[in-house]
């Protein structure tokens, strides 16, 4: 039994790290393998993760970690029974993939403005709580080419956009993801999307002027 692609891990920097690797051939990951991990610290327990299959030869393990600090370093040992297949280490703060933002809501009752809000997925005691910035993806349900990304480079989990920037009488969807620049993280997964109907209508004068102008052509 041989490891083809060594484990690579990412951490949500609150409680979960996910490690993935590939074996040399078809493997029943949960029956044949164990990933043992331990925080390099005075008082730390040895933990064991039972991997799941991710394809025929791929394995994935969810490592539970708690109360992370920036200096944390874990030893990782991949075992097949009594045989040590691979030994490595993992520093969560250097491989951060934030949790996805939650509770995305679109308010359409603010005059001529769409207000999108979501919640920061971290509690206030977590380092990432004040470090996240966001990207919001809005797309037309019926036209995949009508899609845009808004970068939210401030920390407030809200976005205001003019309803007039979207097509009227069309259903739109939005989703949001996060990243932490200070920890050089990857992007989080997208949040679940939320749907709304853009009922915005142009004011009459603007509408009238537009048609008058068009008539002259």
């Amino acid at each position: 039994m041989k490891v083809l692609q060594e484990p690579t891990c990412v951490s949500d920097y609150i409680s979960l790290s996910t490690c993935e690797w590939k074996m040399g051939g078809p493997t029943n990951c949960s029956a044949e393998l164990r990933l043992v991990y331990q925080l390099v610290f005075l008082i730390s327990e040895t933990n064991m993760c039972v991997p799941e299959n991710n394809g025929a030869a791929g394995c994935v393990c969810h490592l539970f970690m708690e109360d992370m600090v920036g200096a944390d370093n874990y030893t990782l040992d991949l075992w097949a029974g009594q045989q040590l297949l691979w030994k490595g280490s993992f520093k969560p703060s250097e491989h951060v993939k934030p949790k996805a933002p939650e509770n995305l809501t679109v308010y359409t009752n603010v005059s001529e403005t769409l207000l999108l809000t979501w919640s920061n997925p971290y509690p206030p005691d977590n380092y990432l709580y004040e470090k996240l910035t966001y990207a919001v993806n809005i797309w037309n349900e019926n036209d995949p080419t009508d899609s845009r990304i808004y970068d939210v480079t401030y920390q407030e989990p809200t976005l205001r956009i003019a309803a007039s920037t979207l097509k009227s009488g069309v259903s739109y969807r939005a989703r949001v993801r996060a990243w932490a620049q200070s920890y050089n993280s990857t992007w989080s997964e997208w949040s679940p999307s939320t749907k709304w109907y853009n009922a915005y209508k142009e004011p009459f004068e603007k509408h009238h002027h537009h048609h008058h102008h068009h008539h002259h052509h």
Epitope: F41, L42, I43, V69, A71, D72
Partner: antibody, heavy 116, light 112 residues
Framework: EVQLVQSGAEVKKPGATVKISCKAS????????MHWVKQAPGKGLEWMGR????????IYASKFQGKATITADTSSNTAYMELSSLRSEDTAVYHC?????????WGQGTLVTVSS | DIVMTQTPLSLSVTPGQPASISCRSS???????????LEWYLQKPGQSPQLLIY???NRFSGVPDRFSGSGSGTDFTLKISRVEAEDVGVYYC?????????FGQGTKLEIK
Amino acid sequence: EVQLVQSGAEVKKPGATVKISCKASGFNIKDTYMHWVKQAPGKGLEWMGRIDPTNGYTIYASKFQGKATITADTSSNTAYMELSSLRSEDTAVYHCVSRRPWFAYWGQGTLVTVSS
Amino acid sequence: DIVMTQTPLSLSVTPGQPASISCRSSQSIVHSNGNTYLEWYLQKPGQSPQLLIYKVTNRFSGVPDRFSGSGSGTDFTLKISRVEAEDVGVYYCFQGSHVPYTFGQGTKLEIK
């Protein structure tokens, strides 16, 4: 042996500032959160705040926001707490504590007396 | 802020007899990572506090097995199966799940 050794007792006048130190030995403070806990005379324990020495990230109980400033120097393996605008209510023993992820190691406490 | 309420506030026990201290939190103290960071500390006279129990039920190393912790949700209990003279002091419960972290007001145990 794991130890947290705090600086000695202080007597300060109202309005003054005091800075207490907490030197760790037997472990690296970067591997833990360093917390501070207040104990007024004859009273219970009150959590004040904490720091992650690796990145300097601090959080405080709202009562101590603006009153306490927690810092850490990883090169000397020492955590500090500064208390400003001292008043008689600040008279207390202040404990530094390392938490990972529970308060396993406590300093001996530093008595700060505020008196005119 | 989460308020931790201990009962009783004082306790007088004959050596060899059991003792029980209750701690109630004003709201759930389950952390977002799924753990319940409920701890018990003993402060002996003239000393700094020392850890007895972490995560509700786990005894810290070196703590005698006469100490046990139990509970869930918002109700927690520390039991001493047979009190000894060295157990005197003030017992505090503590929640480390939600900022600001908070201690109970303390329970003073004395020997009859």
